[in-house]
Interface confidence: low
Amino acid sequence: NWVNVISDLKKIEDLIQSMHIDATLYTESDVHPSCKVTAMKCFLLELQVISLESGDASIHDTVENLIILANNSLSSNGNVTESGCKECEELEEKNIKEFLQSFVHIVQMFINTS
């Protein structure tokens, strides 16, 4: 499922090229392995901002599908409790392009450890 998440992120990246969305999103660009689940949940929350701001049905569908796949993959990790991790609001705000690049990196972390 994580591989499908990456292809969805690439699709979102392609779809937003033609749009002017100037939102900044809370982005964890240096994910510590012991905080990867917490960081992933922040990425998923912020992804919904793209869906709302784009107002585009294709982006909305892709975002929704990505969230299903990611949450399902996270649930197979069990109920992991991580402590000492940053809250979403403590993260740096970055533009959509940088946000999506960091998102791909964290998904790759999950692929490499699964």
Partner: antibody, heavy 120, light 112 residues
Framework: QVQLVQSGAEVKKPGSSVKVSCKAS????????VHWVRQAPGQGLEWVGG????????VFAQKFQGRVTITADESTSTAYMELSSLRSEDTAVYYC?????????????WGQGTTVTVSS | DIVMTQSPLSLPVTPGEPASISCRSS???????????LDWYLQKPGQSPQLLIY???TLQSGVPDRFSGSGSGTDFTLKISRVEAEDVGVYYC?????????FGGGTKLEIK
């Protein structure tokens, strides 16, 4: 009207596989998830997994991961659920159900159920 | 996984009397969009489950208005204003916020 028609009852030996079909009609097959839910005799409902027929993406409950395969054939508007390495605890009625696409799609229409009996 | 807990297990009711079933989730089902992702189903004897209420409070088309749903967050209630003989069966709540979709253990409504 919207309908999901499932294949007939199956009796299987432990260790074998079963494949249950679910034919959809009365709506656009690719606009909705197809979920699979099972119910052991005298027990409650348990979600097995689901498929997005438009994309072929599947999601599963952790306990079935690696043992269940869910597929969809767009040309016949039919979804399939295959469960392998069957054991007696898999004896249940298996339902397919339509769910809205997206994270929060409500599961609104159910098939009539397929009884799978696993017995030596 | 989100755990759904229903009560009571069994509910004997006299026709014409009201009935109430409680469902509690182990975490909030209230999404940031304002909807609670909690659905109610009735499984009549020998039949497939049928949807009664979705998003905690919205009555499914064709379902009699004697059924109503309330609640938010982690506590939800299904009410039947006047029970009829055809309402017998097992009632299930289900959370649709995230996979795995999870169901309550069921409440068996029977006529006294």
């Amino acid at each position: 009207q919207v309908q999901l028609v499932q294949s007939g009852a199956e009796v299987k030996k432990p260790g074998s596989s079963v494949k249950v079909s679910c034919k959809a009609s009365g709506y656009s097959f690719t606009d909705y998830y197809v979920h699979w839910v099972r119910q052991a005799p005298g027990q409650g409902l348990e979600w097995v997994g689901g498929i997005n027929p438009k994309r072929g993406d599947t999601v599963f409950a952790q306990k079935f991961q690696g043992r269940v395969t869910i597929t969809a054939d767009e040309s016949t508007s039919t979804a399939y659920m295959e469960l392998s390495s069957l054991r007696s605890e898999d004896t249940a009625v298996y339902y397919c159900a339509r769910g809205g696409l997206g994270v929060f799609g409500v599961v609104d229409v159910w098939g009539q159920g397929t009884t799978v009996t696993v017995s030596s | 996984d989100i755990v759904m807990t229903q009560s009571p297990l069994s509910l004997p009711v006299t026709p014409g009397e009201p009935a109430s079933i409680s469902c509690r989730s182990s975490q909030s089902l209230l999404h940031s969009n304002g909807y609670n992702y909690l659905d109610w189903y009735l499984q009549k004897p020998g039949q497939s489950p049928q949807l009664l209420i979705y998003a905690a409070t919205t009555l499914q088309s064709g379902v009699p208005d004697r059924f109503s749903g309330s609640g938010s967050g982690t506590d939800f209630t299904l009410k039947i204003s006047r029970v009829e003989a055809e309402d017998v069966g097992v009632y299930y709540c289900m959370q649709a916020l995230q996979t795995p979709l999870t169901f309550g253990g069921g409440t068996k409504l029977e006529i006294k």
